[in-house]
């Protein structure tokens, strides 16, 4: 019995179906086929879980979080024992193993390994201003998404003709911050943060209004 090499790793957007491949060759009839799919979740690497089991001509559930979402892609028994996972969740990310036994055919490699990464587009980011908006002050524009895998990068732009930030601004695309030093009336305006990763983008807007000093009444 020999389980074929798998592609190594699969990426899928959350909510989309994933197919985890596993095929094998055997010299025996598929009368005593036994297939166990296991996962070592990324979030809990010391606690492997059963995903689905085929034994004695019947399919059995594994961990309840896979219940109703997992099945074999084809009619069993077969030499293609790939599975599908519907409505993928972040917690499905991990290393999946198919363990195949088909007595009396023993020996050879009976395990296939495939990594699954569930990707999540950035959630709507939260934009806020830190610091005084008085003229001459320093302000920080903050932008962060609660969700996003891979971790989003953040790009700030000023929504004017140039889309450029003021010359006194410094941007950190990893942290999602823009520091604008010595703000002036020219710093006022609408700013947009674009959070993006491999599978999506999301934006938020922020209105910066620089406060000019009130003229003093001389009486």
């Amino acid at each position: 019995l020999e389980v074929s090499e798998s592609p190594g790793s699969i990426q899928v957007a959350r909510g989309q179906p994933a197919v985890l491949p596993c095929t094998f060759t055997t010299s025996a009839a598929l009368i005593n086929l036994n297939v166990i799919w296991m996962v070592t979740p990324l979030s809990n690497a010391n606690q492997p879980e059963q995903v689905i089991l085929y034994q004695g001509g019947q399919m059995f559930d594994g961990a309840p979080r896979f219940h109703g979402r997992v099945g074999f892609t084809g009619t069993m028994p077969a030499t293609n024992v790939s599975i599908f996972i519907n409505n993928t969740q972040l917690s499905d990310t991990g290393t999946y193993q198919c363990l195949v036994n088909n007595l009396p055919d023993i020996g050879g490699r009976n395990i296939g390994v495939t990594g699954l990464t569930v990707l999540v587009p950035p959630s709507a980011p939260h934009c806020q201003i830190q610091g005084s908006q008085d003229i001459g002050s320093d302000v920080i524009l903050l932008c962060s998404s609660e969700e996003g895998i891979p971790r989003p990068t953040y790009l700030w732009e000023k929504l004017d003709n140039t889309l450029k930030l003021p010359p006194t601004a410094t941007q950190d695309q990893v942290q999602g911050t823009v520091t604008i030093r010595n703000i002036s009336a020219l710093s006022s305006g609408l700013y947009q943060c674009v959070a993006s990763n491999a599978i999506g983008t999301s934006t938020c807007l922020l209105d910066l209004q620089v406060i000019s000093p009130q003229p003093r009444n001389i009486g």
């Epitope: 979030s43 019947q58 961990a63 309840p64 979080r65 219940h67 109703g68 969740q89 917690s91």
Partner: antibody
Framework: EVQVQQSGPELVKTGASVKISCKAS????????MHWVKQSHGMSLEWIGY????????TYNQKFKGKATFTVDTSSSTAYMQFNSLTSEDSAVYYC??????????WGQGTLVTVSA | DIVLTQSPATLSVTPGDSVSLSCRAS??????LHWYQQKSHESPRLLIK???QSISGIPSRFSGSGSGTDFTLSINSVETEDFGMYFC?????????FGAGTKLELK
């Protein structure tokens, strides 16, 4: 449209058994699981177990092992739950629920079982 | 078994109020937490799946959040049709379990 229709209310004597039916329509019956859930009067929900509508394999909550038995009839797209050796504690509304986006995606309307002395 | 503790047991509100219902798990359940609404003499209805994911046909005023052990169902501007019981349910480990419920009632 997915529909799950349960049998009507039952009044049964202590020590007897009752068999509740759950007829499904609007989808491929054998492609899903059917769960059973108990709701005692004014109480929360308790999961009894489920049956695979394709092969009849059942999984029970330890609490209800020996008390409940699940069966399916694929020709009529109907799932059944038999409850044995009934006591007053078994008086409740029993729901069947088809799996889907979650284990309990589509619910039947419930069957009231009243156990009397 | 995983125990789900819902609070408060009863919540009295006026239509138009925004409310948050809490569900706490006795151990981490990732995002394998679902919310159901049950009106008087009706079957439960799925509102939110996997802690925060919306269900087709459910009004957008219902939203969910949380992961691990602490979860929240939020109703933005309660309407009269929202009164009833709300249950959380976990699908992280067997046996599947429900919370005792929160009753949302008219003040």
């Amino acid at each position: 449209e997915v529909q799950v229709q349960q049998s009507g209310p039952e009044l049964v004597k202590t020590g007897a058994s009752v068999k509740i039916s759950c007829k499904a329509s609007g989808y491929s019956f054998t492609g899903y699981y059917m769960h059973w859930v108990k709701q005692s009067h004014g109480m929360s929900l308790e999961w009894i177990g489920y049956i695979s509508c394709s092969n009849g394999a059942s999984t029970y909550n330890q609490k209800f092992k020996g008390k409940a038995t699940f069966t399916v009839d694929t020709s009529s797209s109907t799932a059944y739950m038999q409850f044995n050796s009934l006591t007053s504690e078994d008086s409740a509304v029993y729901y069947c629920a088809r799996s889907g986006e979650t284990p309990f995606a589509y619910w039947g309307q419930g069957t009231l079982v009243t156990v009397s002395a | 078994d995983i125990v789900l503790t819902q609070s408060p047991a009863t919540l009295s509100v006026t239509p138009g109020d925004s409310v948050s219902l809490s569900c706490r798990a006795s151990q981490s359940i990732s995002n394998n937490l679902h919310w159901y609404q049950q009106k008087s003499h009706e079957s439960p209805r799925l509102l939110i799946k996997y802690a925060s994911q919306s269900i087709s046909g459910i009004p957008s005023r219902f939203s969910g959040s949380g992961s691990g052990t602490d979860f929240t169902l939020s109703i933005n501007s309660v309407e009269t049709e929202d009164f009833g019981m709300y249950f959380c349910q976990q699908s992280n480990s067997w046996p599947l379990t429900f919370g005792a419920g929160t009753k949302l009632e008219l003040k």
